[in-house]
């Protein structure tokens, strides 16, 4: 055939677009051509040739007169995808041929499944609430909205805010609570998630506050807690940050915490904890249990000398701790602790209470009150002073024979022996572990002698027993170890006077210096059991008010006592010892004064030396207490003088019922030396201690004072 | 019309290697998966993977991966299936199937008996 | 791999008679679900796709239905020409059923 004049070429007039589409749906891609003569039309897919009707009449591509491609229903698989791709239309005559432009064709899809169900979620009132969803795969990308018991969520609500497929509750309130079902949808369709069950719940509150009380001991106290909260809440108490110790406290339905009868011990801060799934909640109060006031030491009747020093002791106890103060009986003048000392008073009250009167005159002589006072009650005690001449001093009493250590039978019965003379005539009383004895318990007596009985024996009564023998003229104590087991004896062994050593002689002195005095004696009268060893017992009025052991384990029957006070009286007694226990005590030495400080030593100018040991600054460190009657000292020393010998480390007890304001002393013989032990201790008593240095008789500046107790062993079961 | 037509029976000995062919035609080959199925005699169905024409994407189940290999021309619309180290057990019939857009086999080849004996 | 248990594997029916066979999946499938027919020395041929959709040019006597992991496929009066196996298959995975052959009583 010739070419016609009037023919052209193909040119696409009408171009497909591209196109998505749901699956199953029907579409249709554009094509229109013009040419002439009338151009045939086909489609290609990614580069191959499309099937239509006109090639298999089952076809669901059908090509339309006008040169379009029609789809019945657009078929997509998981895949098998027949129908998406990149389609082109191509229009032929014999004068050549024109490509349209490419136009894709894509599924719209919609998954079943999402890739994220929202889950569950509690939260408490007040608090932010995100439920979080993926929707589907799908194409185009599916976006989300949501349901809440089934009804669309209209975010537009400030509280509620939906991004990236996160419902987001700002500030939930009880009413937010439900199911929510997140949607994901797009042209395909739309798809619900799982449901999520939002909760709300509220965290505790309070509806009453437990308050703080203030109560005296052995009154009821109730503690009130009402909570609300959703879940209920669970309600418990706590004591000081720790749980309830059991059987003290009752705890009512309503949670009020209950005390029958309240102790000092149970003071402390009460903490009510209510708490549920979403949060907790405490709230404390404060039991201050007032106790009256209580003597732990009286002040005793005392005989001392005029120009001696006396002390009375009153050790109170109470809650809150009573103020102390001091007056004689007749004066208005009232004495307190830690009162700066009037000029040319000689009166003085110590922190915990106990009144010294330095340089004894005639007229101090009378009746001294202690008195303390709380806002729980008050109490006083009286106590006389009677000042005699120097002549009459008298010394505290002495224990003739004392308890001995023994082991005994559960069952058994203890005699815990105490003989004691004096001018005036001790009382004796008794201690164990440090506290008064025997109290109620009726299986224990202190019969006429002193001696402490104590029958049908318990593992229990395992522990130091001390005798103590008071006068006004001072007091002296004497302990004994009672070990109470199975296998013991069943009564104490009665040692008589036979089996043990007879006294010594009265000992003589044969030398003394300012600080030691030098003793003989002859062993006890012939016919008495042979002592194995001595032990040395000392008294100064001016020391302390009781006797104190200053030698152990004399083998010999001359002996010096070293580290003595000068220009002091004493005054010694001598015992004997053999395997069955101490003998009575010899007769009193004569008293005996230590020489006073001799002059400086030629050579040394007294005023440097002075001078030097005043500028020594000595910092005593925290005790430590190595076991129930030991004790570490340690010290540093800011300069170390040329003119140094030793430290002097006194201490004296402040508590307890020997509570004395004499110091006693342990030298440190060495300069360099910057520690010492301090052994005997009394157990569960409280001791102040202070260091100075010293060079030949004189001294520096004492330390600063510290206070340590020593530990109570607890008897063993 | 859209059919799939196999190759003929085939008789091997245990180790040996089958290569069975099935070739389409009325439709596109590229736009539909074709997968293979076999049926040992007096059993069921079992598929034994497929292969995307398009781009030559295959996937086996567990069974057969080592000892099964599909491939395609598109140039002639034939797919290909091929066993190896052939087992007794191996006897069966062999089915191509073409997996329409809606995940269903909805063409199946007229099957292919292969034989393994000594 | 989802494993799909058919019951019967065989049952006997009179031509008319209503027969069900039913498909167990594993886990769910949702509705990716195929039934196929196969006849002596045949191919299989498809019935059912997508659970219950009825392939084109298959009679309506059959149905199918069910999703997640219930499967039923129905023939509502069995014909002569009905008397085959019948295989289910997860389209998700490709696997088949155990077949369920059905006889004439």
């Known amino acids: 055939s010739r070419l016609r004049q009037e023919d052209f070429p193909p040119r696409i007039v009408e171009h497909p677009s591209d196109v998505i589409v749901s699956k199953g749906e029907p579409t249709t891609l554009n094509c229109k051509a013009e040419g002439r003569p009338t151009p045939t039309i086909e489609w290609y897919k990614d580069g191959e040739r499309v099937e239509t009707d006109k090639d298999d009449p089952r076809s669901h591509r059908m090509l339309l007169p006008s040169g379009s491609l029609f789809f019945l229903r657009i078929v997509h698989g998981r895949r098998s995808k027949p129908d998406e791709g990149s389609y082109v239309c191509v229009a032929r005559n014999y004068l050549g041929e024109a490509v349209s432009r490419n136009a894709s064709l894509e599924v719209a899809l919609l998954r079943d499944d999402f890739r994220q169900n929202p889950t569950d979620v509690v939260v408490a009132a007040g608090e932010p609430a995100i439920l979080e969803c993926q929707p589907p795969r799908g194409h185009p990308e599916p976006t989300i909205y949501w349901k809440k018991d089934k009804v669309r969520i209209d975010d537009k609500e400030e509280r509620i805010s939906i991004r990236g497929g996160k419902l987001m509750i700002s500030n939930t309130r009880k009413s937010d609570a439900g199911m929510y079902t997140c949607v994901g949808t797009n042209m395909v369709g739309e798809r619900d998630s799982d449901p999520a069950e939002l909760t709300v719940f509220e965290r505790p509150t309070f509806l009453r506050r437990p308050i703080n009380q203030v109560v005296l001991e052995e009154e009821a106290v109730e503690f009130r807690c009402q909570v609300q909260g959703d879940p209920q809440p669970t309600v418990r108490w706590k004591k000081d940050d720790a749980d309830l110790p059991r059987g003290r406290y009752d705890i009512k339905d309503d949670y009020t915490l209950r005390i029958k009868k309240t102790m000092s011990t149970d003071e402390g801060t009460y903490m009510c904890i209510a708490e549920n799934r979403v949060g907790k909640m405490e709230a404390s109060a404060t039991l201050t249990v007032r106790a009256p006031p209580q003597f732990v030491v009286r002040p005793r009747d005392q005989i001392v000398a005029q120009g001696r020093t006396v002390t009375f002791p009153c050790e109170t106890k109470g809650n809150p701790q009573p103020a102390v103060f001091w007056q004689k009986e007749g004066s208005q003048n009232l004495l307190f602790p830690n009162q700066p000392q009037q000029p040319n008073s000689r009166c003085s009250v110590s922190p915990t209470g106990d009144l010294t009167i330095t340089n004894i005159q005639r007229s101090d002589a009378g009746y001294y009150i202690c008195q303390a006072l709380t806002v729980a009650g008050s109490i006083l005690a009286k106590a006389q002073l009677e000042v005699t001449d120097v002549l009459t001093d008298r010394p505290p009493p002495i224990i003739l024979q004392g308890p001995a250590n023994q082991t005994l039978a559960v069952d058994g019965t203890a005699l815990l022996k105490c003989k004691a003379t004096g001018d005036p005539l001790p009382v004796i009383s008794w201690l164990k572990e440090g506290f008064t004895f025997p109290g109620r318990d009726p299986r224990a007596t202190i019969q006429e002698q002193g001696t402490l009985q104590i029958k049908n024996l318990r593992i229990s009564d395992t522990g130091t027993y001390t005798c103590v023998a008071t006068s006004s003229s001072g007091e002296t104590s004497w302990s004994a170890v009672l070990d109470v087991t199975e296998s013991g004896a069943t009564i104490s062994k009665n040692y008589d006077l036979s089996d043990l050593p007879g006294p010594p002689s009265k000992p003589q002195v044969t030398d003394v210096t300012k600080n030691s005095v030098t003793l003989s004696w002859q062993p006890g009268t012939p016919g008495t059991l042979p002592a194995s060893a001595y032990i040395i017992e000392a008294f100064s009025q001016s020391v302390s008010n009781s006797w104190q052991t200053v030698a152990n384990h004399v083998k010999t029957t001359l002996y010096t006592v070293r580290g003595l006070r000068p220009n002091t009286i004493y005054l010694f007694m001598v015992r004997a010892i053999n395997p069955q226990g101490l003998s009575d005590p010899s007769p009193m030495s004569d008293p005996v004064r230590t020489q006073d400080i001799s002059p400086p030593a030629q050579g040394v100018d007294h005023r440097q030396v002075q001078k030097e040991l005043g500028d020594v600054l000595v910092r005593l460190h925290n005790p430590v207490v190595l076991t129930p009657t030991t004790v570490q000292v340690t010290w540093t020393v800011d300069r170390q003088p040329q003119f140094i010998q030793g430290y002097r480390v006194m201490y004296r007890q402040t508590s307890g019922l020997q509570a004395t304001s004499s110091w006693q002393n342990l030298d440190a013989k060495v300069p360099t030396e910057r520690s010492a032990v301090l052994v005997n201790l009394k157990k569960g008593v409280t001791y102040e201690i202070k260091v100075r240095p010293y060079f030949n008789e004189f001294q520096g500046m004492d330390s600063e004072s510290k206070t340590v107790r020593t530990t109570e062993e607890a008897p063993s079961a | 019309q859209v059919q799939l037509v196999q190759s003929g029976a085939e008789v091997k000995k245990p180790g040996a290697s089958v290569k069975v062919s099935c070739k389409a035609s009325g439709y596109t080959f590229t736009g539909y998966y074709m997968h293979w199925v076999r049926q040992a005699p007096g059993q069921g169905l079992e598929w034994m993977g497929w292969i995307n024409p398009k781009n030559g994407d295959t996937e086996f189940p567990q069974k057969f991966q080592g000892r099964v290999t599909m491939t395609r021309d598109t140039s002639i619309s034939t797919a290909y299936m091929d066993l190896s180290r052939l087992r007794s057990d191996d006897t069966a019939v062999y089915y191509c199937a073409r997996e329409s857009g809606d995940d269903a086999f909805d063409i199946w080849g007229q099957g292919t008996m292969v034989t393994v004996s000594s | 791999d989802i494993v799909m248990t058919q019951s019967p594997s065989s049952l006997s029916a009179s031509v008319g008679d209503r027969v069900t066979i039913t498909c167990r999946a594993s886990?769910?499938?949702?509705?990716?679900l195929n039934w196929y027919q196969q006849k002596p020395g045949k191919a299989p041929k498809l019935l059912i796709y997508?659970?219950?959709s009825l392939q084109s040019g298959v009679p309506s006597r059959f149905s199918g239905s069910g999703s997640g992991t219930d499967f039923t496929l129905t023939i509502s009066s069995l014909q002569p020409e009905d008397f085959a196996t019948y295989y289910c298959q997860q389209s998700v995975g490709l696997f088949f059923g155990g077949g369920t052959k059905v006889e004439i009583k």
């Open positions: 886990q769910s499938i949702s509705s990716y």
């Open positions: 997508a659970a219950s």
